[in-house]
């Protein structure tokens, strides 16, 4: 599929000009490349009418000219002195006509309208509101004032002062009369459709000294809006409907076959089931625009959207809307990155975030998506050592492996934390993506104590058991704090014996901590990386407390106190369960748990959003074992 | 966590004018949904206006809408409440406040950060 996009129909009257806008990927090949517009032949082909590269056909000469706007990835072509003959198929595009870099263009060029004398032109949108104007004399005040509407040779009464409306205006129109000093009256229509749209005559009286006034009111369909962004990318759509729809539901709705228009999001809490995880509607200003954001842009995603207002909260005749039409570029500068992550109950998982590499140094968030009230995205994390309090000790966000991607690692996971999360950053607002975490059934991989008590003064072991399927990889602690997991010493005691089908390449990595002090309670977490890529995590909470008896305290899996609602083996072992979520290139010989299928099913996630959520610091443990 | 600090407040007229100030330290306020408030004497704090992350998505209270104009400067971390056409029932300690929503519909409890307010005092 070419990657160029432009507006599929132009428009236009005799006389008047045309500006037509193709976009294209970019990459510093396309920058430089030629750009041509050229017309379709009946037996095929492309004559160039007009190139970047400087040439101007003879039927262009002096009327059109070609506009390259590297820095945008935009080519604009003008044509003016507009005449019927410019109607045709075109194309614009880049390199050579023939190569099938292009996009077809209809244009349209029609006569301007025959008009009567003293005839007043009403241009409106459609879904919007006239006020057709109608002098009078003086004669003609206490007589009967009318509006028709020439249909075919006829004309047919739309509204008179006598209280008479055509049954297709009805609750639409009013006829209102100046006061005494003004000889006018008007008529309103709210609400205009395609076909209130033709000749008008307004007449004051009805005998041969009756006043008249010919109207023509022009509806016009807005023009859609070009939207040109990349797969896996985000697009905003900022509705402006005008202040008279404030208070009338707002919606947004995708164009399937004909005139049927999908709702993708209302006001009234209708959501589209593909849409699920990936948008937002934000609320109306006090003008009554609003703006919607969608992420995770998918191929299926390209197409004709519509905002509008109605009280219905969908498109219906007479709704004042505003049109895009939305290209989706396969060649995306945004890399693949897993839009589903599993992750076991119990364990972790590690998300990869891509961001704008021009980036590096903006503020990266991570937020959980909430479907309630039109959705909303509660910030849980952010790079500037920030991190929502119900979230201390499990989550942390790195700015590993850079270079355009962090890494956000959640563990301790619960059935809650199913949902949708997004990767923001405070930069480049088209490289918002998306990825939903499933709770998935399984066994745990690390095995970890339970939540460890140590003594001030004394030393604290703690041990973690790697599998053999982690021999290769780099396996480490750290004390969690709300800036990252800052690395400490640990010491490989040999093989582990906490494995039943493992061999000699099991490991068990233990945490020495000497002269243990009030700063050493806190969270650490065991876990596994290759390079700069993080695998999975289990967390311990390590209490302190005063010294009762002398010596060191060395926790074994089976002393550990276990909490409550864990799980102790036989053997004594509390299971941290750590199926899952890591960069696939790291993990290839685990089963796949990185599906990278969009899917938009499984369980939200529930995240309190209480008075509380601001308050990051990792000095409370009010809400942990121990 | 962010700390707000409000100014800009002061005695004026009615259907005079005023800036209120909110400046944020501590974090950087782009990914707060931001707003202001207001306390009248022996009335309970009410909404007034809030602004998104990005500043292209505004709400206000019906009581000031037209009259009022918030906004922000993220590069300055400091969030604005531009009030014009002041009334003597506007007179109250307004409060700057802070929730960490990137986007959508925030209701009012979710406001998680407070400033200690400003005075406003609008004379008939």
């Known amino acids: 599929k070419s990657p160029i996009f432009g507006p599929e129909e132009v428009n236009s009257v005799e006389g008047n000009s045309v500006s037509i806008t193709c976009y294209y990927p970019p990459t510093s090949v396309n920058r430089h490349t030629r750009k041509y517009w050229c017309r379709q032949g009946a037996r095929g082909g492309c004559i160039t009418l007009i190139s970047s590269e400087g040439y101007v056909s003879s039927k262009y000469a002096g009327r059109a000219n070609l506009t390259n706007f590297p820095e945008n990835g935009t080519f604009v072509v003008n044509i003016a002195q507009l005449s019927q003959d410019d109607s045709g198929r075109y194309k614009c595009g880049l390199g050579i006509n023939s190569r099938g870099l292009s996009f077809d263009v209809s244009l349209e060029v029609s006569q301007g309208p025959g008009l009567l004398n003293d005839t007043k032109v009403y241009t409106v949108d459609l879904g919007r509101t006239v006020t057709i104007n109608c002098p009078f004399k003086t004669e003609n005040a206490q007589k009967r004032k009318s509006l028709y509407k020439q249909i075919g040779l006829y004309p047919v009464l739309v509204i008179d002062s006598s209280g008479y409306v055509n049954p297709n205006y009805t609750g639409r129109i009013r006829l209102d009369i100046q006061g005494t000093g003004q000889l006018l009256f008007s008529v309103v229509i709210n609400q205009l459709r395609l076909s209130d749209a033709g000749q008008y005559l307004c007449q004051a009286g009805d005998d041969s000294n009756s006043n008249k006034k010919n109207a023509d009111l022009q509806v016009l369909k807005p023009e859609p809006e070009l939207v040109y962004e990349d797969l896996r990318g985000s697009v905003t759509f900022h509705c402006a409907l005008g202040p008279e729809v404030a208070n009338v539901a707002k919606f947004l709705c995708r164009q399937s076959s004909g005139e049927n228009c999908d709702v993708v999001v209302n006001t009234l809490g209708k959501r589209a089931p593909a849409f699920e995880g990936r948008i937002l509607l934000n609320p109306q200003d006090k003008d009554g625009s609003f703006s919607v954001v969608i992420t995770g842009l998918r191929k299926e995603d390209a197409g004709r959207y519509l905002c509008g207002a109605h009280s219905d909260g969908q498109l219906q005749e007479g709704s004042p809307i505003q049109a895009w039409q939305l290209f989706v570029n396969e060649e995306s500068t945004i890399p693949r990155s897993p839009t589903v992550v599993k992750g076991v109950a119990g364990s972790s998982v590690a998300v990869l975030c891509p961001y704008n590499r021009k980036e590096s140094k903006s503020i990266k968030y991570w937020c959980l998506w909430e479907g309630a009230q039109n959705g909303r995205c509660p910030l849980l994390v952010d790079s500037e050592g920030w991190v929502k309090a119900q979230y201390e000790g499990r989550l942390s966000l790195l700015e590993e492996p850079g270079n355009g991607t962090f890494t956000v690692i959640l563990n301790q996971l619960t059935s809650r934390d199913a949902g949708f999360y997004w990767c923001l950053t405070n930069g480049d607002t088209l490289w918002r993506t998306t990825v939903e975490i499933k709770i998935i059934e399984g066994e745990p991989n690390l095995k970890v104590p339970g939540n460890v008590t140590a003594v001030l003064g004394e030393t604290l072991k703690v041990p973690c058991h790697f599998p053999c399927k982690f021999s290769s990889y780099e396996k480490y602690w750290c004390k969690w704090n709300n800036t990252g997991c800052q690395a400490l010493p640990s010491q490989d005691e040999g093989p582990s014996k906490a494995f039943v089908n493992c061999d000699e390449n099991s490991r068990l990595v233990s945490l020495t901590l000497n002269l243990v002090t009030r700063a050493d309670e806190g969270w650490y977490w065991c876990g596994v990386k290759q390079g700069h890529f993080y695998g999975e995590t289990a967390a311990v909470y390590v209490a302190v407390e005063e010294r009762k008896a002398a010596g060191s305290r060395d926790v074994s899996l089976a002393k550990a106190d276990a909490a409550p609602d864990e799980k102790v083996l036989d053997s004594g072992f509390r299971e941290i369960e750590n199926k899952a979520i890591q960069d696939p290139r790291l993990f290839a010989e685990e089963k796949a748990v990185a599906d990278t299928r969009d899917q938009a099913d499984g369980s939200r996630a529930s995240v309190d959003s209480g008075s509380s959520e601001e308050q990051g610091g990792s000095s409370r443990h009010h809400h942990h074992h121990h | 966590q962010v700390q707000l600090v409000e100014s800009g407040g002061g005695l004026v007229q009615a259907g005079g004018s005023l800036r209120l100030s909110c400046a944020a330290s501590?974090?950087?306020?782009?990914?707060?949904?931001m707003g202001w408030f207001r306390q009248a004497p022996g009335k309970e704090r009410e909404f007034v206006a809030r602004i998104d992350w990005s500043g292209s998505s505004t709400d206000y209270a019906d009581s000031v809408k037209g009259r009022f104009t918030i906004s922000r400067d993220n590069a300055k971390n400091t969030v604005y409440l531009q009030m014009n056409s002041l009334k003597p029932e506007d007179t109250a300690v307004y409060y700057c406040?802070?929730?960490?929503?990137?986007?959508?519909?925030?209701?009012?409890?979710?406001?998680?950060?407070w400033g200690q307010g400003t005075q406003v005092t609008v004379s008939s």
């Open positions: 501590g974090r950087t306020i782009y990914g707060y949904v």
């Open positions: 406040a802070g929730s960490a929503y990137y986007s959508g519909y925030v209701t009012h409890r979710d406001f998680g950060s």
